[in-house]
């Protein structure tokens, strides 16, 4: 009767960028609804996204409490209109997610070059310090606040007239590079967490070139 048409969720997948974290799963529900629970390895289960027909659940609020913890989620399946019903073993059907450690696994979002300023043969390039949803003392922390020196940026820079990309690295959000006087340069940055073996790099920032409005030139 109650659960004959209920199927367990599958392909549970964490989608996370700069700690904004969503659990996705399949299938699209037919005559059933889902509830998600999340827990740390040693903690209690907390329910989220109650009786939803969505196949995703935003768990950001939970994981930002401690991004270095390892989390496990599970998705329960219930018959639509009869959510009290349980499976044959007296439990609703559920499926576990893979474990997820936000600090080690969240994808690095695409960085943005905030500004660049040329003074003679030096250019200072500044990367925007993106705000995350991780909080401390009621304020949102930046990516740099969370990762500290674990996060570096690689700057690619090249003369507008050539194709070879020189590189520089920083564990702050600023680069100071040498350039040839009278040449226009283009810039792109990439966020990197070198200690990781997965999700080490962001996508490249949009390219910014000298002679455009973000830059400033001083003799």
């Amino acid at each position: 009767s109650g659960t004959t048409n209920t199927v367990a969720a599958y392909n549970l997948t964490w989608k996370s960028t700069n700690f904004k974290t969503i659990l996705e799963w399949e299938p699209k529900p037919v005559n059933q609804v889902y509830t998600v629970q999340i827990s740390t390895k040693s903690g209690d289960w907390k329910s989220k996204c109650f009786y939803t027909t969505d196949t995703e659940c935003d768990l950001t609020d939970e994981i930002v409490k401690d991004v270095k913890q390892t989390y496990l989620a599970r998705v329960f399946s219930y018959p639509a209109g009869n959510v009290e019903s349980t499976g044959s073993a007296g439990e609703p059907l559920y499926e576990n997610s893979p474990e997820f450690t936000p600090y080690l696994e969240t994808n690095l979002g695409q960085p943005t070059i905030q500004s660049f300023e040329q003074v003679g043969t030096k250019v200072n390039v500044t990367v925007e310090d993106e705000r995350t949803l991780v909080r401390r003392n009621n304020t949102f922390l930046s990516l740099r606040d969370v990762f500290g020196k674990d996060l570096i940026y690689t700057l690619y820079y090249w003369k507008s007239s050539s194709s070879g990309k020189k590189t520089a690295k920083t564990n702050t959000n600023e680069f100071l590079i040498d350039v040839d006087k009278g040449e226009n340069y283009c810039f792109s940055v990439q966020a990197v967490i070198p200690s990781r073996t997965v999700n080490r790099k962001s996508t490249d920032s949009p390219v910014e070139c000298m002679g455009q409005e973000k830059g400033e030139f001083r003799e």
Epitope: I152, G164, A168, K169, T170, Q190, P194, V198, K201, D204
Partner: antibody
């Protein structure tokens, strides 16, 4: 286990071409940077160029610019060094090396090298 | 390009000796200097990174230091397996550049 294995070296005539391969295992090249370094017989190490396989960006030493081209096939987890218009002075052992792109560490893993001899 | 001037080009030493090799950068490279060891017919192996940090698995008799643009590799007590050629490298800016090498031979 992280490993880099170069292949494709051999004897080639001046003006000829050769393509070297650098097959990586134990890591994914797209999240690192791959460099080529060469060493002429009895000489020191000379940096040739790099590729960031995630975006295709490259840079070359002046001595090889326009003649040597680095590419990568992330589906094969392999980087390549295409060598054209070869000269006697290109004779060397060619190494590929992994750059973890950290602030502090340079090339942490190297291949065993492949010998290219340019001679008539 | 930044030049890395390495000295001496060769030295003779005995097992147990303290050996010092220096590299001078032609301009500021911060601490972005590495040292490699290379044995004949083999690829270079990373010993020291960031001027003074010992790479994983490298014996503690190897150490590195920095004073401005001068960088030093020290082997506190030379062992038989340490006879090899040593290279410094700056990776502060593109292109990364190597010193000319120092061959450590048995006296």
């Amino acid at each position: 286990e992280v490993q880099l294995v170069e292949s494709g070296g051999g004897l080639v005539q001046p003006g000829g071409s050769l393509r070297l391969s650098c097959a990586a295992s134990g890591f994914t090249i797209s999240i690192y940077t791959i460099h080529w370094v060469r060493q002429a017989p009895g000489k020191g190490l000379e940096w040739v160029g790099y590729i960031d396989p995630s975006n295709g960006y490259t840079y070359y030493a002046d001595s090889v610019k326009g003649r040597l081209t680095i590419s990568a096939d992330t589906s094969k987890n392999t980087a390549y060094l295409q060598m054209n218009s070869l000269r006697a002075e290109d004779t060397a052992v060619y190494y590929c090396a992994r750059d973890p792109q950290s602030i502090s560490s340079p090339f942490d893993y190297w291949g065993q090298g492949t010998l290219v001899t340019v001679s008539s | 390009d930044i030049q890395m001037t390495q000295s001496p080009s060769s030295l003779s030493a005995s097992v147990g000796d303290r050996v010092t090799i220096t590299c001078r950068a032609s301009q500021d490279v911060n601490t972005a200097v590495a040292w490699y060891q290379q044995k004949p017919g083999k690829a270079p192996k990373l010993l020291i990174y960031s001027a003074s940090f010992l790479y994983s698995g490298v014996p503690s008799r190897f150490s590195g230091s920095r004073s401005g643009t001068d960088f030093t590799l020290t082997i506190s007590s030379l062992q038989p397996e340490d006879f090899a050629t040593y290279y410094c490298q700056q990776h502060y800016t593109t292109p990364p550049t190597f010193g000319q090498g120092t061959k450590v031979e048995i006296k």
